[in-house]
């Protein structure tokens, strides 16, 4: 067993060694969204570029119909940034009358869908109040964390208002995941 | 071929096994920038601490002249946080007259330079409008994502205004990359 | 030495191959904090959920008494998001009288404690001024970076004001680390 001498035996019992370059990985970048109907109380999902420019999928990680498909069970690091932009937010007007109010907000959610489970699972949420006065505004929300996923799980990015997403540049709004 | 029994053959065909501790990695931390001339329409690059305190480079990942040098092709996770700070932003004055305007902004870009390619590639951008009234302000921009890089690529962090970066502490402003 | 043919010899000299699934990892999620005494000039540490819902610890990474315990020396990626929420910040009132002042702020610090070293080390800090007028506000601070840690090191997340942390959902406020 000479070839094992650098790989302690307690590790080999339950997990095969594997080449890093073979792991499922994806980095998706923003594209112009087509206006679509979505349910009133449900945040719409973004769709993504998966092969042009900086975008790629590899090693059986596939993108289809707004979803990243997880091809292999394991621990994944998942991340996304969404840059939002808009004009003076509504709350600034109401402020002037001196009445506090529910602020405008921007929200990003990374959601997991498991076919065998009826409800999607919210993995990550970034949410910000937006109360700007007298000028256009823009700002990103960044999210990233590690999750245990199962083969067949699907990941998507949902936003509170698809019309505020900055889809102009691939470096401003993106979504990715990789097996650790 | 006893030593291969825990490494499935389909992986070994195109990617060698390799020890994780041997992978190129760097975490760079902020240092005070010396005011220097730079081109008018180009965001200046930050320079970094690469060996004192929390900062390090290892396994052939080198830092030189504002650049991280990529020593080996592969998929890298790249990240940076820049903390900005300033005084009341200009737009707050214009607001008072009730006129919307182009807001002040802060921007961070992680840029890739490939010697064989004439134009730098913007990998990541975080950009925020800043419209503060009546007090000093401070806030971070965080970025992180995975990219396929080639041996010889160089990475840098550019900012919209080098004079607004918080240089005081190594935990506030930093830049790193590691091979996955 | 047939089993070594896919693992270049220069790597094997100083680092054993190891299975990725065996690496220490944790993702902790927010729980309601119990009001506790803390020193006046010291940011309080958050405590966390470590096994329910999305939370987990594995491969000898343990959570105890607000700390993640590092079971093995190496390079770790460490991350946290804390979502804060509050009412109109104090500075907005003072602004109305036309007097600039020190703004309210929200701060997250990821701290390393090494028993053999007297002072904790601040690894990461995210800090933002909060000057909102006329409405409730909410916003996240996200941090993440790579650090070289030693077996026995302990990690915690400190915040400037524990009463402003949004502890309502596991996807809004979280803390994690994994060995690279």
């Amino acid at each position: 067993l000479k070839g094992q001498e650098f790989a302690p035996s307690h590790q080999q019992v339950y997990a095969p060694l594997r080449a890093d370059g073979d792991k499922p990985r994806a980095h998706l970048t923003v594209v112009r969204q087509t206006p679509t109907q979505h349910f009133k109380n449900q945040f719409p999902a973004l769709h993504w570029e998966h092969e042009l420019g900086l975008a790629f999928t590899k090693n059986r990680m596939n993108y289809t119909n707004k979803f990243l498909l997880i091809p292999e069970s394991g621990d994944y690091f998942i991340y996304s940034q969404v840059t939002f932009r808009g004009m003076t937010s509504e709350c600034s007007e109401i402020r002037r009358a001196g009445r506090p109010n529910k602020p405008d907000s921007i929200t990003v959610v990374i959601t997991k869908v498991t076919d065998s489970y009826p409800e999607p699972t919210q993995l990550l949420m970034g949410t910000k109040s937006v109360c700007e006065v007298g000028s256009n505004w823009f700002q990103p929300i960044y999210l990233g964390a590690m999750f245990s996923l199962q083969e067949g799980d699907k990941l998507m990015v949902n936003v509170s208002d698809i019309s505020l997403v900055d889809y102009t540049k691939e470096d401003k709004t993106f979504f990715g995941a990789f097996l650790l | 071929l006893k030593g291969q029994e825990f490494a499935p053959s389909h992986q070994q065909v195109y990617a060698p096994l390799r020890a994780d501790g041997d992978k190129p990695r760097a975490h760079l931390t902020v240092v005070r920038q010396t005011p220097t001339q730079h081109f008018k329409n180009q965001f200046p690059a930050l320079h970094w601490e690469h060996e004192l305190g929390l900062a390090f480079t290892k396994n052939r990942m080198n830092y030189t002249n504002k650049f991280l040098l990529i020593p080996e092709s592969g998929d890298y996770f790249i990240y940076s946080q820049v903390t900005f700070r300033g005084m009341t932003s200009e737009c707050s004055e214009i607001r008072r007259a009730g006129r919307p305007n182009k807001p002040d902004s802060i921007t961070v870009v992680i840029t890739k330079v490939t010697d064989s390619y004439p134009e730098p590639t913007q990998l990541l951008m975080g950009t925020k409008s800043v419209c503060e009234v009546g007090s000093n302000w401070f806030q971070p921009i965080y970025l992180g994502a995975m990219f396929s890089l080639q041996e010889g690529d160089k990475l840098m962090v550019n900012v919209s205004d080098i004079s607004l970066v918080d240089y005081t502490k190594e935990d506030k402003t930093f830049f790193g990359a590691f091979l996955l | 030495l047939k089993g070594q043919e896919f693992a270049p010899s220069h790597q094997q000299v100083y680092a054993p191959l190891r299975a990725d699934g065996d690496k220490p990892r944790a993702h902790l999620t927010v729980v309601r904090q119990t009001p506790t005494q803390h020193f006046k000039n010291q940011f309080p540490a958050l405590h966390w959920e470590h096994e329910l819902g999305l939370a987990f610890t594995k491969n000898r990474m343990n959570y105890t008494n607000k700390f993640l315990l590092i079971p093995e020396s190496g390079d770790y990626f460490i991350y946290s998001q804390v979502t804060f929420r509050g009412m109109t910040s104090e500075c907005s009132e003072i602004r109305r009288a036309g007097r600039p002042n020190k703004p309210d702020s929200i701060t997250v610090v990821i701290t390393k404690v090494t028993d053999s070293y007297p002072e904790p080390t601040q690894l990461l800090m995210g800090t933002k001024s909060v000057c909102e007028v006329g409405s409730n506000w909410f916003q996240p601070i996200y941090l993440g970076a790579m650090f070289s840690l030693q077996e026995g090191d302990k990690l915690m997340v400190n915040v400037s004001d524990i009463s402003l942390v949004d502890y309502t959902k596991e996807d809004k406020t979280f803390f994690g680390a994994f060995l690279l």
Epitope: - | Q37, R85, T168 | -
Partner: antibody, heavy 117, light 108 residues
């Protein structure tokens, strides 16, 4: 609100060492860089140099060979030493907070240092 | 080093009038890294403008900075009695940081 209080000897003979100290209150010392600036009738305002909470310094090249800016063992206050003074070093010396970067938004009261034989 | 020349040396104006102060650099100042200060006799300077045009916290909007490259201007739209003082420019586009010689604004 930030306050800077400075003290030190106001009258020196040529070749002596100027020594001034500045204490900061009202803000965290570690959140800023801290500078020394002087003002003389002959040369106007002149930046001497700055320091941060870790003791890292930047100096004006024209004074670098004679200047040391340092921290107290506790970090705050910080001090200025200027060796081998001449009449040309006669000036009002100010300590100041460097904020946001390389500009000075808060100043000490100033100390007139006169070099005369 | 960059040398800053301020003109005029003295400006004699009445309250309510507009003051225009000039600061010229011996070479281009990077990123418009230029600041303006106000100083009363026997007091420390006070920061008015940084980044050529950004007002410092608490500075009234009658003070306006403009310019880029080598030519910069501080404009006081309507002089108030408390505006009579000496004004200095400072560049921070390259090291060492340098100051201009000052413009005195006096009451006519």
């Amino acid at each position: 609100q930030v306050q800077l209080h400075q003290w030190g000897a106001g009258l020196l003979k040529p070749s002596e060492t100027l020594s001034l100290t500045c204490a900061v209150s009202g803000v965290s010392f570690s959140d800023y860089h801290w500078a020394w600036i002087r003002q003389s009738p002959g040369k106007g305002l002149e930046w001497i140099g700055d320091i941060n909470h870790r003791g890292r310094t930047n100096y004006n090249p024209s004074l670098k060979s004679r200047v040391t800016i340092s921290l107290d063992t506790s970090g705050n206050p910080f001090s200025l030493k200027l060796t081998s003074v001449t009449a040309a070093d006669t000036a009002v010396y100010y300590c100041a907070r460097d904020f946001p970067n390389w500009v000075f938004d808060s100043w000490g009261q100033g100390i007139l240092v006169t070099v005369s034989s | 080093e960059i040398v800053l020349s301020q003109s005029p040396g003295t400006l004699s104006l009445s309250p309510g009038e507009r003051a225009t102060l000039s600061c010229r650099a011996s070479q281009s100042v990077s990123s418009s890294f230029l600041a303006w200060y106000q100083q009363y006799p026997g007091q420390a300077p006070r920061l008015l403008i940084y980044g050529a045009s950004r007002r410092a916290t608490g500075i009234p909007d009658r003070f306006r900075g403009s310019g880029s490259g080598t030519d910069f201007t501080l404009t006081i739209s309507r002089l108030e009695p408390e505006d009579f003082a000496v004004y200095y420019c400072q560049q921070y586009g390259s090291s060492p940081l340098t100051f201009g010689g000052g413009t005195k604004v006096e009451n006519k």
